[in-house]
Amino acid sequence: EPPTACREKQYLINSQCCSLCQPGQKLVSDCTEFTETECLPCGESEFLDTWNRETHCHQHKYCDPNLGLRVQQKGTSETDTICTCEEGWHCTSEACESCVLHRSCSPGFGVKQIATGVSDTICEPCPVGFFSNVSSAFEKCHPWTSCETKDLVVQQAGTNKTDVVCGPQDRLR
């Protein structure tokens, strides 16, 4: 009775448990009773990252500069190329197939987390006591100026988009 299962580094074909090809190699021919599985290394710019019985290696990912991509890690015969985005841009997906410009935080919002090559800017509304008067991908919310510490008084209240305006204290005549 032929086998119905094989060990993990083997595959079942023609009632034989044949050795899988190791990462970085592709299948040329299946084993027989008397001949071993034949495997060949992947070519330049190709890879296979698992024990396999693939007859073709996968092409390394191309980091297209026209899409704002650049190589973060060069591929090997066992690993794919890893792309990332040019400065100021981030990936649109986990696979990083294209890039978009980092979002800026509008006035009234500050940067909670600066963007990376794989994540966009995270903005947060400026809470009471803080403001942002610029559209920026880097600027946090700034605290209102403390008029008191300058021996001044608030002449105009601050908002989430504007700082307080300080002025001299009224002198008693």
């Epitope: 060990r7 580094k9 599985t37 495997c39």
Partner: antibody, heavy 127, light 107 residues
Framework: EVQLLESGGGLVRPGGSLRLSCAAS????????MNWVRQAPGKGLEWVSY????????DYADSVKGRFTVSRDNSKNLLYLQMNSLRAEDTAVYYC????????????????????WGQGTMVTVSS | DIQLTQSPSSLTASVGDRVTITCRSS??????LAWYQQKPGKPPKLLIY???SLEGGVPSRFSGSGSGTDFTLTISSLQPEDFATYYC?????????FGQGTKLEIK
């Protein structure tokens, strides 16, 4: 130190049940395929069962198929052999053994062998 | 199922002798064969895997050869600690099977 330690053996009546355990230490148990092999008194080695690293694939010798069940708990580093409907001919020392896959980067196919064995636990089936 | 037949079943030899044990498979198993040594009251010990590769820590006086259906284990110069029982095992497909063993005794 890489070690396997079997337990759970003993005297059992024909038709009875027993559960053997094999505690693994000194290596990443969940990455290895495992086997049970037995040896009747004064006799040779007999492969009993196989289990893949995840527990997804199992296989058995014809002599125990339908009566024995192999399982594993990778979180506890334990291998089990549940033995039901025991017969006198199941009397043996039961060993757990680690499957290892040897390969090099030359591209030549790798090879399996059982490189680590426990000391064994004796199972006696008698009335 | 694949049957493995070892010969001889028992063998008497002296320290320093060259000894060869053979293992024949009922069907082709390429090089999916391992050899083990077992001493009384002890578990088996892996000597050779892939028909001819020496397991780490095993003395170089042990060697394996063969492919397909015919395999041999050779001990080039017997040492006192080599007197034991030797088994071949096929790991080509399930069910995995062992040869019946060869008992190597001191003359």
């Amino acid at each position: 130190e890489v070690q396997l330690l079997e337990s759970g053996g003993g005297l059992v009546r024909p038709g009875g049940s027993l559960r053997l355990s094999c505690a693994a230490s000194g290596f990443t148990f969940g990455s290895y395929e495992m086997n049970w092999v037995r040896q009747a008194p004064g006799k040779g080695l007999e492969w009993v069962s196989y289990i893949s690293s995840s527990g997804e694939t199992t296989d058995y010798a014809d002599s125990v198929k339908g009566r024995f069940t192999v399982s594993r708990d990778n979180s506890k580093n334990l291998l089990y052999l549940q033995m039901n409907s025991l017969r006198a001919e199941d009397t043996a020392v039961y060993y757990c053994a680690r499957d290892v896959f040897f390969f090099d980067s030359s591209g030549s196919p790798g090879a399996y062998g059982m490189d680590v064995w426990g000391q064994g636990t004796m199972v006696t089936v008698s009335s | 199922d694949i049957q493995l037949t070892q010969s001889p079943s028992s063998l008497t030899a002296s320290v320093g002798d060259r000894v060869t044990i053979t293992c024949r498979s009922s069907q082709g198993i390429r090089s999916s064969l391992a050899w083990y040594q077992q001493k009384p009251g002890k578990p088996p010990k892996l000597l050779i895997y892939g028909a001819s590769s020496l397991e780490g820590g095993v003395p170089s006086r042990f060697s394996g050869s063969g492919s397909g259906t015919d395999f041999t284990l050779t001990i080039s110069s017997l040492q006192p600690e080599d007197f034991a029982t030797y088994y071949c095992q096929q790991l080509n497909s399930f069910p995995s099977t062992f040869g019946q063993g060869t008992k190597l005794e001191i003359k």
